[in-house]
């Protein structure tokens, strides 16, 4: 087996993104300048660490959660890298074209980096159901259709729905699961004889795959209050997203021991359940006014997680291809929908508390905005599915998915592993 | 005792940049959104800009975009209001507010509690 | 885009006053109003539609949702001539309604 890219794959990959490379550096030299007003140094640190807690949980949390395959772990943490690293850039340019470039050269703020790392998280979610099928020309093209397809949503649902940053990045989690099993819908499926034991996990890297998740544990009430306005919001959000994530690691490591026959404790419902109360709590962590709340979706949401665990990979594997590891894509799916659901109901109360007689039409809305969302997403995702099918790419045979050797040189191993 | 002081406004051409200072004083303004709202000579009040509390984000009235910056440092409880190619349509009474949040169920309300006593921004050839 | 009717009215003291604030989609109850006298700055008076803003005469109220709002003086006392705007907070950057004036009858 060699340990070389194809030739056609090392010729198109370097030049692919190299050239995508130098038109950014030009359209950040031509089109963009940093703010000047900045008065408040240690203003500027305490932002920054917001940023710097979103980019930790990037890099290293979904770098390291997606690592949990045999023979895959190298290639899931850097290719996380590398997208988040273009993501981010193109993010910024595009959130700067679609809404400040009418009055003239985009601003580049610490908000507007804290907003591109958000967008490419995005892309970080989505792709755990493809990692391990596709090449890193590939998947340039999938981080410039998400991020593209994102930030124009984000635009949309702002202008016509009137929805706060907040409240339009908090589709991230629905838009990024269902754009990611679109393209895994698209991908060819079976893997070949022989190449089975490649998508199972190994212990070293679902250790990994266990530290990111911790970090992505740590680092969630950040991510949920770094859109919000006020510091009452900020606090709420952050307490809320705390005790509703607490409770659904109890929920998700008992929930897991009770799904299994013998008691035992799964480690591929363990890393992703963990997590669960983060997400469902996100739309609307803000607005919990309690704590016993946010740790009763906690609760739910753990157990929703470890049930999707036990029954939906066996669907999605023959359906999508997704490996059995790789359950972001419907965790966050039902999730998302689970917090998009909250949401409706607090906006139900809301309106029937101001004795409002809208409440169908504020639910028809919320319910447009959700729509809108997954319709983009999965059109998109098609879109990218497509695409990455074009032979131009020279995406990895079936025989060779989920194998580091393809891309990795490994001085110390003739073949396999 | 709960107050802001805006200073800086004056007379300048067309053309002109002008800088407005806003302190704050018997509260920390760093747990707050500030704002900038305007009232022409006779006329209505104009939101024209506001800044997060911590300084991260920034909004502006279309009619000003890309000609003012609102920024604040929070070391000093000032906020500022940067003023570049001002117009004859400028011409206002300039006050800065404080903005509170109120939770309600399905999103937060935000309204303006504090406001100063305003200064007077005269754009003239 | 707010809107406000009437644009202004003369009434005398003791009278019941009631201005109305119109907005161009629902904005639930996320709208606020101020009064202004004339050479001074803005005072909020009712936010979230309903709330009182504590020291503000328990006369003025506030109600409505959706689309449309209203301010009440129940008794208009010789301090409350000025002119009134409502605000609203829907939409991540405000806007006010062009403004009611108050004067003496």
């Known amino acids: 087996m060699s340990s070389k890219y194809p030739r056609s794959v090392r010729r198109c990959l370097p030049l692919w993104a190299l050239t995508l490379e130098a038109a950014l550096i030009l359209l950040f030299y031509f089109f963009t300048h940093y703010d000047a007003s900045l008065e408040d140094q240690k203003g500027l640190v305490a932002s920054y660490q917001v940023g710097q807690d979103l980019t930790v949980m990037a890099a290293i949390g979904l770098g390291f959660l997606t690592s949990s395959f045999r023979r895959h772990s190298w290639s899931s943490v850097a290719f996380n890298l590398f997208m988040l690293a273009l993501g981010v850039q193109w993010a910024i340019l595009l959130d700067g074209f679609l809404s400040q470039f009418p009055s003239g050269k985009v601003v580049i703020t610490l908000f507007s980096i804290r907003l591109a790392t958000m967008s490419a998280l995005s892309v970080l979610i989505s792709v755990d159901a493809v990692l391990g099928k596709v090449n890193l020309a590939q998947l340039v093209v999938m981080v410039l259709v998400e991020v593209t397809a994102l930030g124009n949503l984000r635009m949309v649902i702002s202008n016509i729905f009137n929805t706060d940053y907040h409240m339009n990045m908090m589709h991230i989690y629905v838009f990024a699961a269902y754009f990611g099993l679109s393209v895994a819908w698209c991908l060819p499926k079976p893997l070949p004889e022989g190449t089975e034991d490649k998508d199972q996990t190994a212990t070293i890297p679902s250790l990994s795959a266990m530290l990111g998740a911790l970090f992505l544990w740590m680092f969630w009430p950040s991510f949920n209050s770094a859109l919000l306005r006020s510091p009452i919001e900020r606090k709420n959000a952050v307490f809320n997203t705390y005790y509703a994530v607490a409770v659904s690691v109890v929920t998700a490591i008992s929930g897991s021991s009770l799904a299994h026959p013998q008691g035992k404790i799964s480690k591929t419902y363990v890393h992703s359940a963990v997590l669960a109360g983060g997400v469902a709590v996100g739309t609307s962590c803000h607005l919990i006014p309690s704590p016993w709340l946010a740790m009763v979706l906690g609760l739910v949401a753990g157990l929703i997680s470890v049930g999707g665990a036990k029954y939906l990979p066996g669907c999605c594997n023959r359906v999508l291809g997704i490996p059995h590891s790789s359950i972001m894509g419907y965790n966050f799916s039902l999730l998302g929908l689970l917090g998009e659901i909250i949401y409706i109901v607090l906006l139900v109360l809301d309106t029937v508390g101001a004795g409002n007689g809208m409440i169908g039409f504020q639910v028809l809305l919320s319910i447009g905005e959700l729509s809108l969302a997954i319709v983009i997403a999965l059109m998109s995702g098609l879109l990218t599915g497509l695409l990455l099918n074009l032979k131009i790419w020279k995406a990895p045979h079936e025989a060779k998915y989920f194998d580091d050797q393809v891309f990795w040189k490994f001085p110390h191993l003739a073949v396999g592993f | 005792q709960v107050k802001l002081l805006e200073s800086g406004g004056g007379v300048v051409q067309p053309g002109g940049s002008l800088r407005l200072s806003c302190v704050a004083s018997?509260?920390?303004?760093?747990?707050?959104?500030m704002h900038w709202v305007r009232q022409a000579p006779g006329k209505g009040l104009e939101w024209v800009a506001f800044i997060w509390f911590d300084g991260s984000n920034k909004g502006y009235v279309d009619s000003v975009k890309g000609r003012f910056t609102i920024s604040r440092d929070n070391s000093k409880n000032t906020l500022y209001l940067q003023m570049k190619s001002l117009r004859a349509e400028d011409t206002a009474v300039y006050y800065c507010?404080?903005?509170?949040?109120?939770?309600?169920?399905?999103?937060?309300?935000?309204?303006?509690?504090?406001w100063g006593k305003g200064t007077t921004v005269t754009v003239s050839s | 885009v707010m809107t406000q009717s009437p644009s202004s009215l003369s009434a005398s003291v003791g009278d019941r006053v009631t201005i109305t604030c119109r907005a161009s989609?629902?904005?639930?109850?996320?709208l606020n109003w101020y009064q202004q006298k004339p050479g001074k700055a803005p005072k909020l008076l009712i936010y979230a539609a309903s709330s009182l803003q504590s020291g503000v005469p328990s006369r003025f109220s506030g109600s409505g949702s959706g689309t449309d709002f209203t301010l009440t003086i129940s008794s208009l006392q010789p301090e409350d001539f000025a002119t009134y705007y409502c605000?609203?907070?829907?939409?991540?950057?405000?806007?006010f309604g062009p403004g009611t004036k108050v004067d003496i009858k």
């Open positions: 507010a404080r903005e509170k949040a109120l939770r309600g169920i399905s999103r937060y309300n935000y309204y303006l509690d504090v």
């Open positions: 018997g509260f920390t303004s760093r747990s707050y959104g």
């Open positions: 989609q629902s904005i639930s109850s996320y």
């Open positions: 605000q609203q907070s829907y939409s991540t950057r405000f806007t």
